[in-house]
């Protein structure tokens, strides 16, 4: 399987909410001995590999923001801890996997990574990740709503988030 990032860049005004999204592509094994671990973290475009460094999002580590379940089950993070920080990550039955950040500030700007681990309990872990940039802007040049930029080069027109 692979992870797709529908949008590679999110440009948002201060105070807005944004939902960063990743999507699982390809066949997903739903067997008893396969589970999925999904999480989010901040990173940098490191020398070794993008997303290899794991930094907290608003003081919450990737351990705090994880989802761990089987197949295409829906899941949510621990509500109280994440929501106290204006965060919520969720996963649906269709392979979509997101983190919502509320009341954005300039400090939220940076590179965000989603990590998906397919765990085959008697064999190995298979890791894939996706990366996207969040730019939070203030002042007269800031958009009125979040503007998202598709990852695929063939579809380069802007899409304004509802």
């Amino acid at each position: 399987f692979k992870v797709a990032t529908p949008y590679s860049l999110y440009v948002c005004p201060e105070g807005q909410n944004v939902t960063l999204t990743c999507r699982l592509l390809g066949p997903v094994d739903k067997g008893h001995d396969v589970t999925f671990y999904k999480t989010w973290y901040r990173s940098s475009r490191g020398e070794v590999q993008t997303c290899s460094e794991r930094r907290p999002i608003r003081n919450l580590t990737f351990q705090d923001l994880h989802l761990h379940h089987g197949g295409h089950q829906a899941a949510n993070t621990s509500h109280d801890l994440a929501q106290r920080h204006g965060l919520e990550s969720a996963s649906d039955h269709h392979g979509n996997f997101s983190i919502t950040m509320r009341n954005l500030t300039l400090l939220d700007s940076g590179l965000y990574c989603c990590l998906v681990v397919e765990i085959r309990h008697h064999h190995s872990e298979h890791r894939v990740h996706g990366a996207m940039e969040l730019q939070v802007q203030t002042g007269k040049d800031a958009p009125s709503n979040c503007v998202v930029y598709p990852s695929s080069s063939q579809d380069s027109e802007n899409i304004t988030a509802a």
Partner: antibody
């Protein structure tokens, strides 16, 4: 802050079954993997196996025929049973939280189990 | 299973010196390698994950490097509390395995 605490008898007779329990406090057991790791006196670390709260298990092939790991989410506990023990099973037994694509990030303090008649 | 070989078995150094510990895997583990520190009578403590990322609260004097089969843990300037046994551990496949350990002792 998540903490782990092992409990169980410190002395087991040869050919009997070693039984240990790990209690998870300060956090939910309903996520991650929960592992058992052992360390014979003066030697290195050996991973025994883990359980996911869903019940999925994974054991070290070298011990698989003798090991059972189970979980009781209502008590926030997971347990190890090792059958037909010999003196070679004498070790400090640790329980640990195992996060996928990460590491064993939280460990119990360990409990010494001696196999002797 | 993947065998991890650590060297040297014992490293005798003085406080303030640089310690370089090696871990070699019998086959590639990509960068899926962790390092732990264990002091007598205590459980291991996670230092490094994914070959070079420091775990939360670990001082900057600890650094990891390497990928594939050869890895290094470096302690830039040994503090008295750093004298301990260090283990590497792979998690590219199961069974999860540890190296035999390197003891860093006071010279």
């Amino acid at each position: 802050q998540v903490q782990l605490q092992e409990s169980g008898p410190g002395l087991v007779k040869p050919s009997e079954t070693l039984s240990l329990t790990c209690t998870v406090s300060g956090g939910s057991i309903s996520s991650y993997h929960w592992s058992w790791i052992r360390q014979p006196p003066g030697k290195g670390l050996e991973w025994i196996g883990y359980i996911h709260y869903s019940g999925s298990t994974n054991y070290n092939p070298s011990l698989k025929s003798r090991v059972t790991i189970s979980v009781d989410t209502s008590k926030s506990q997971f347990s190890l049973k090792l059958s037909s023990v010999t003196a070679a099973d004498t070790a400090v037994y640790y329980c640990a939280r195992d996060i996928p694509a990460f590491a064993f990030d939280i460990w119990g303090q360990g409990t010494m189990v001696i196999v002797s008649s | 299973e993947i065998v991890l070989t650590q060297s040297p078995a014992t490293l005798s150094l003085s406080p303030g010196e640089r310690a370089t510990l090696s871990c070699r895997a019998s086959q590639s583990v990509s960068y899926y390698l962790a390092w732990y520190q264990q002091k007598p009578g205590q459980a291991p403590r996670l230092l490094i994950y994914d070959a070079f990322n420091r775990a939360t609260g670990i001082p900057a004097r600890f650094s990891g490097s390497g990928s594939g089969t050869d890895f290094t843990l470096t302690i830039s300037s040994l503090e008295p509390e750093d004298f301990a046994v260090y283990y590497c551990q792979q998690r590219i496949n199961w069974p999860l395995t540890f190296g035999g350990g390197t003891k860093v002792e006071i010279k």
